[in-house]
């Protein structure tokens, strides 16, 4: 009886539209028992792993990936995946990070709330292999 791993979710704090130079934190969530969360950028070729996993609730764990000073190059699509040995989960939906010049205008808020249920998501591709979430043999590049 194969146990299905729930898909992770991804959100961004304080939002998905971030002024240049400000900080953003991606929050990945999954079930209890996750050892490693992986934040993938655009495609699987660039990612960052963390084992700093905390229990967000009795049934949920989470990890946080912070970019201290957002640059234009940080804009793009992000998604989460997790390792609950011996299996990797499916990917979360995509979350799009937008980077804007700081305008400071009163009519434009600095950030918009963002999560994997938000309007900027795309459905994840289904070409994943649960045992090979990153391109085989490809060296991990840090996201920041």
């Amino acid at each position: 009886q194969e146990e299905d791993l729930p898909r992770p979710s991804i959100s961004a704090e304080p939002g998905t539209v971030i002024p240049l130079g400000s900080h953003v934190t991606f929050v990945c969530r999954g079930p209890v028992g996750v050892q490693t969360f992986r934040l993938e950028r655009d495609s699987r070729s660039t990612y960052n792993d963390t084992e700093d996993v905390s229990q967000a609730s009795p049934s949920e764990s989470e990890a946080r990936f912070r970019i201290d000073s957002v640059r234009e190059g940080n804009a793009g699509l992000y998604r989460c995946i997790y390792y609950k040995p011996p299996k990797w989960s499916e990917q979360s939906d995509y979350l799009e990070l937008l980077v804007k010049e700081s305008s400071g205008g009163p009519d434009s808020p600095d950030t918009e709330p963002g999560s994997s249920a938000g309007p900027t998501q795309r459905p994840s591709d289904n070409s994943h292999n649960e045992h090979a979430p990153a391109s085989q043999g490809l060296k991990a590049e840090h996201l920041y």
């Epitope: 009886q1 146990e3 209890v32 028992g33 050892q35 490693t36 992986r38 792993d49 963390t50 084992e51 390792y83 040995p85 011996p86 990797w88 045992h131 090979a132 979430p133 990153a134 085989q136 043999g137 490809l138 991990a140």
Partner: antibody, heavy 109, light 109 residues
């Protein structure tokens, strides 16, 4: 596949490095576990290295045993201050589902 | 210290019968990280069950795992001669530490 190498006869107090060579999967996606089994005895967990490259160890193994990624396809287990009680077959495994045949380490003068 | 106790060092049953192997942990296993292994002489262990009750691919449904917290069991039904082996439980604990039980030999009559 997974295969251990480097086992041999070592004198007490000596050091030894074992190598786990993997093929068909990426070390960046799996825990690589090390386990040993003394002749006629049970299995004993030593430690593992995670996809992120962090090492986790049994309390008795800390300090004397070090697990590291030596290349994109090899993981090493470095053992120091060896004694007769370290005589065992040493196994590496991809998490727990794929094991090597083991390599015999004998500590004797 | 983490201790996994397999109370019976040996159990026996006839072909077609059922055996139950118990495993008790001194601490609660983390998030059902309890595996069962089969080992035959001269071979590496083979994982049968992980996450307490999930069968590894290719393992017959005659094998089943159950339990929670600190008490776990492996049941082998419709026993076959090929099931004669030593069976080990393995617990995973918060902080990513693991420990094996002492093993239970299954004798098929």
């Amino acid at each position: 596949s997974v295969k251990e190498s480097g086992g041999r006869l070592v004198t007490p107090g000596g050091s030894l490095t074992l190598t786990c060579t993997v093929s068909g999967f990426s070390l960046s996606n799996y825990n690589i576990q090390w386990v040993r089994q003394a002749p006629g005895k049970g299995l004993e967990w030593i430690g593992f290295i995670s996809p992120a490259g962090n090492g986790y160890y049994a309390s008795w193994a800390k300090g004397r045993f070090t697990i590291s990624k030596a290349s994109s396809t090899t993981v090493e287990l470095k053992m120091t201050s060896l004694t007769a009680s370290d005589t065992a077959t040493y196994f590496c495994a991809r998490h727990w589902d794929l094991w090597g045949p083991g390599t015999l380490v004998t500590i004797s003068s | 210290e983490l201790v996994l106790t397999q109370t019976a060092s040996s159990v026996s049953a006839a072909v077609g019968g059922t055996v139950t192997i118990s495993c008790q942990s001194s601490q609660s296993v983390y998030s059902n990280y309890l595996s069962w292994f089969q080992q035959k002489p001269g071979q590496p262990p083979k994982e049968l069950v992980y996450w307490t009750s999930t069968l590894q691919s290719g393992v017959p449904s005659r094998f089943s795992g159950s339990g929670s917290g600190t008490q776990f069991t492996l049941t082998i039904s419709d026993l076959e001669c090929d099931d004669a082996a030593t069976y080990y439980c393995l617990g995973g604990y918060s902080g990513w530490f693991y420990a094996f039980g002492g093993g239970t030999e299954v004798v098929v009559k």
